[in-house]
């Protein structure tokens, strides 16, 4: 069979949620392999995912070193088999990714309601503080640790018997809301970073309702 040309990667796309960050690209390789390099604007190009036939590369370990830095990646196409390199002077083809700033761009993962507790006409709703892969002093930081007050949560709540929703906001992971005595309520939360221009909001958490296992009801 004849030789084919090495082709450059295209559609380089960052997929990132709560800082778990994967670079994806096309095409599926035929007689070629890929190596990815990542760099900050001022840093060295570091090779990762050597000679791979995958079309994705997990770059989490690199970006969590400083989530506020801006990163650039590039994907090299290397001939592997019955192919000819189309790079000039023996240089392999490569394609650059868009720039990526994790702190500003990572998607906020779907939050989870950890618990709710009713005391009389008050309900305390707690949002799980999800662990990220960002490390400090050898421990993993939570989403709140990383974003601090930049991160707020919006609570949507409504009586089980009606569809009218109310909202509350907090810059902690807890809400304290007023409810009508003797009524069951349902809750859903959403993570929000108001200062962002893109990827401002997470998807809504699964709905949790009073009278189910997750909550605790105490009549005072």
């Amino acid at each position: 069979s004849g030789t084919t040309n090495t082709v450059a990667a295209y559609n380089l796309t960052w997929k990132s949620t709560n800082f778990k960050t994967i670079l994806e690209w096309e095409p599926k390789p035929v007689n070629q392999v890929y190596t990815v390099q990542i760099s900050t604007k001022s840093g060295d190009w570091k090779s990762k995912c050597f000679y791979t036939t995958d079309t994705e590369c997990d770059l989490t370990d690199e970006i969590v070193k400083d989530v506020k830095q801006t990163y650039l990646a590039r994907v090299f196409s290397y001939p592997a088999g019955n192919v000819e390199s189309t790079g000039s002077a023996g240089e392999p083809l490569y394609e650059n990714s868009p720039e990526f700033t994790p702190y500003l761009e990572t998607n906020l993962g779907q939050p989870t309601i950890q618990s709710f507790e009713q005391v009389g006409t008050k309900v305390n709703v707690t949002v799980e503080d999800e662990r990220t892969l960002v490390r400090r002093n050898n421990t993993f930081l939570s989403l709140r640790d990383v974003f601090g007050k930049d991160l707020i949560y919006t609570l949507y709540y409504w009586k089980s018997s009606s569809s009218g929703k109310k909202t509350a906001k907090t810059n902690t992971n807890e809400f304290l809301i007023d409810v009508d005595k003797g009524e069951n309520y349902c809750f859903s939360v959403q993570a929000v970073i108001p200062s962002r221009t893109v990827n401002r909001k997470s998807t809504d958490s699964p709905v949790e309702c009073m009278g189910q296992e997750k909550g605790e009801f105490r009549e005072i």
Partner: antibody, heavy 117, light 106 residues
Framework: EVQLVQSGAEVKKPGESLKISCKGS????????MNWVRQMPGKGLEWMGM????????RLNQKFKDKATLSVDKSISTAYLQWSSLKASDTAMYYC??????????WGQGTTVTVSS | EIVLTQSPATLSLSPGERATLSCSAS?????MNWYQQKPGQAPRIWIY???NLASGIPARFSGSGSGTDFTLTISSLEPEDFAVYYC?????????FGGGTKVEIK
């Protein structure tokens, strides 16, 4: 011109420690992974592992995990391979080699390590 | 780890003859290199990416293969070709070398 210059031959006794070096020049030392390869007398090549000088990340062949340690000193563009307690079976030629694609191929001249009582 | 088995261990041939060196992998490999090593010297890249000749390597050398079976072929041996040849896979960590094939003068 890219060059990797390794330290000279070593003769050691079992149980002694040793650190051999590989000095890079003619390129950005921190930008390239550095491989270490072992060749026991009359035998083939074995990939021991590699280190990225900019942040000292290592990828180590598990076979050598408890035997040898890779390190770097960026300030003098030097990579190191060290042992805390040598054995006779560590007797070998050790090569450093810059991780490169394709025709780019830069190896040190090798360091002979002899461990004998 | 991927084990690479080279055969034969020794190939005794005369100048002008064709040499076929095999490298068999214990599981599928997508990126294979070949190195040449002469006594007292460091190895030197010979073929990379299965079939690409390194800079300055004469066209009498060729590489081929896929999956688990790879071949280095020398169409007509020259005196300077007598050496040991190693295959190396870089598809998965740890990267591994074959045991080598010594091409010696008959």
């Amino acid at each position: 011109e890219v060059q990797l210059v390794q330290s000279g031959a070593e003769v050691k006794k079992p149980g002694e420690s040793l650190k051999i070096s590989c000095k890079g020049s003619g390129y950005s030392f921190t930008s390239y992974w550095m491989n270490w390869v072992r060749q026991m007398p009359g035998k083939g090549l074995e990939w021991m592992g590699m280190i990225y000088p900019a942040d000292s990340e290592t990828r180590l062949n598990q076979k050598f995990k408890d035997k040898a340690t890779l390190s770097v000193d960026k300030s003098i563009s030097t990579a190191y391979l060290q042992w805390s307690s040598l054995k006779a079976s560590d007797t070998a030629m050790y090569y450093c080699a810059r991780e490169d694609y394709g025709s780019s191929d830069y190896w040190g001249q090798g360091t002979t390590v002899t461990v004998s009582s | 780890e991927i084990v690479l088995t080279q055969s034969p261990a020794t190939l005794s041939l005369s100048p002008g003859e064709r040499a076929t060196l095999s490298c068999s992998a214990s599981s599928s490999v997508s990126y294979m290199n070949w190195y040449q090593q002469k006594p007292g010297q460091a190895p030197r890249i010979w073929i990379y990416g299965i079939s690409n000749l390194a800079s300055g390597i004469p066209a009498r050398f060729s590489g081929s293969g896929s999956g688990t079976d790879f071949t280095l072929t020398i169409s007509s041996l020259e005196p300077e070709d007598f050496a040991v040849y190693y295959c190396q896979q870089k598809s998965s960590f740890p990267w591994t070398f074959g045991g080598g094939t010594k091409v010696e003068i008959k």
